[in-house]
Amino acid sequence: MRTEAQVPALQPPEPGLEGAMGHRTLVLPWVLLTLCVTAGTPEVWVQVRMEATELSSFTIRCGFLGSGSISLVTVSWGGPNGAGGTTLAVLHPERGIRQWAPARQARWETQSSISLILEGSGASSPCANTTFCCKFASFPEGSWEACGSLPPSSDPGLSAPPTPAPILRADLAGILGVSGVLLFGCVYLLHLLRRHKHRPAPRLQPSRTSPQAPRARAWAPSQASQAALHVPYATINTSCRPATLDTAHPHGGPSWWASLPTHAAHRPQGPAAWASTPIPARGSFVSVENGLYAQAGERPPHTGPGLTLFPDPRGPRAMEGPLGVR
């Protein structure tokens, strides 16, 4: 699980305390620490909302929280894309948007988030317990997908709190390639730091230049992300029970949100971020079935004054050929 921790500044050893070999040994931890701090497991969050005014009208919002550049976003329903799901929309950063009924309006909200409005009538309209999935293809992380649906039963008079329930998926090429190397590097770094801990020379001490130590990110792989390597998808119940719509408030009460981060969700910062939408709950979960979620990891608190958010601005990715990835 990824956590935010205050790390004391690393002070270089005093000259002459270690030989050339020791100096080389210290360069590697610095490089690895830089990698560990700047690169992390990407995340996808999904929010599904049923409009109270249009009982079968849905708004799906998805976001990608990673350092890579997005090359394509695919929104599907009835399960993950490529695993029985039906594509609703494909959003290419440069070329535009393709959408299929009952998708009514898909658009890029920011450089890392999209929204999709679904038609509220007709035979192909969604029902309350439909599973919606967002798949982000990015470089170098690979493809990451999260799925979610509205809670099976919602009190029409109350606004349901965000319910974390992602389905994690990472293409092995992406996660095993880059993340594997980084994971090994981080473990090795910890090993080196531990070894140095017992020596008098390179020591960890508070920075002398600043009263407050710089903040850095440190993490270990979550159980959920490990599970993603072994179990491609969790089982999803996609049966449509129209009766679930009966719980909706007929006179326009609050909307219900299901907020689904795949790891600890760092919200995109800046004016483009959605201030009006709830911040997804942070934590790692594996979806067992619609409405039944087994927690797979400790849930850290929401971002507070003691934690730092790392904004993740990135530019558009160049077009990948005429058809892109379709």
């Epitope: 959003l91 440069e94 535009g96 309006q105 658009r107 890029w108 920011t110 558009p316 077009m319």
Partner: antibody, heavy 120, light 113 residues
Framework: EVQLQQSGPELVKPGTSVKISCKAS????????MNWVRQSHEKSLEWIGE????????NYNQNFKAKATLTVDKSSNTAYMELRSLTSEDSAVFYC?????????????WGQGTSVTVSS | DIVMTQSPSSLAVSVGQKVTMSCKSS????????????LAWYQQKPGQSPKLLVY???TRESGVPDRFIGSGSGTDFTLTITSVQAEDLADYFC?????????FGGGTKLEIN
Amino acid sequence: EVQLQQSGPELVKPGTSVKISCKASGYTFTDYYMNWVRQSHEKSLEWIGEINPKNGDTNYNQNFKAKATLTVDKSSNTAYMELRSLTSEDSAVFYCAREGVSSYYGMDSWGQGTSVTVSS
Amino acid sequence: DIVMTQSPSSLAVSVGQKVTMSCKSSQSLLNGFNQKNFLAWYQQKPGQSPKLLVYFASTRESGVPDRFIGSGSGTDFTLTITSVQAEDLADYFCQQHHSTPPTFGGGTKLEIN
């Protein structure tokens, strides 16, 4: 040079079907979606739908889903549109248009058009 | 569907004059990722098929004379012909290429005095 050559004009009777063709040349046929557009005096230009020649996937304007069927023959680099249950209101000029290089729905090359007249 | 509205429906100008035509969309055509407006302009000369002039609201298609200038953002767009030539006699259509289904405006007929 990109060229889209459409079949000739059609005069058909109400209730029947017609299949018009669009032969592509000058580019890799499977690299670009093929769009079909209808032009009538009353309704200007209307997008009917598109087909991905690579795998045959289609995307229709809901207004034409019951009227048009899009297909391709990769071996001859040809796209087809069949129009069924024709009425006099279906009389129009139909164009095939290649999707643009830069955008999903910008259409950078058009066929010369096929006139379909429905009359008894 | 996104509704495209063009005005005027027709206009007559003399050769060498500057002309502007308007196109409005019922929704913003701005792509939030790359800040491009997904709007195209087409020219259709009498008896011919449409020809792409401008895409992304202001990017001129290769081979199109530089007297054709597309501008605007969000929901309001304009095609300007800085110095009209006799061969510019045609119908001009705007089209949103933002999302399905792509939709066209009703057209502006340009006539030469």
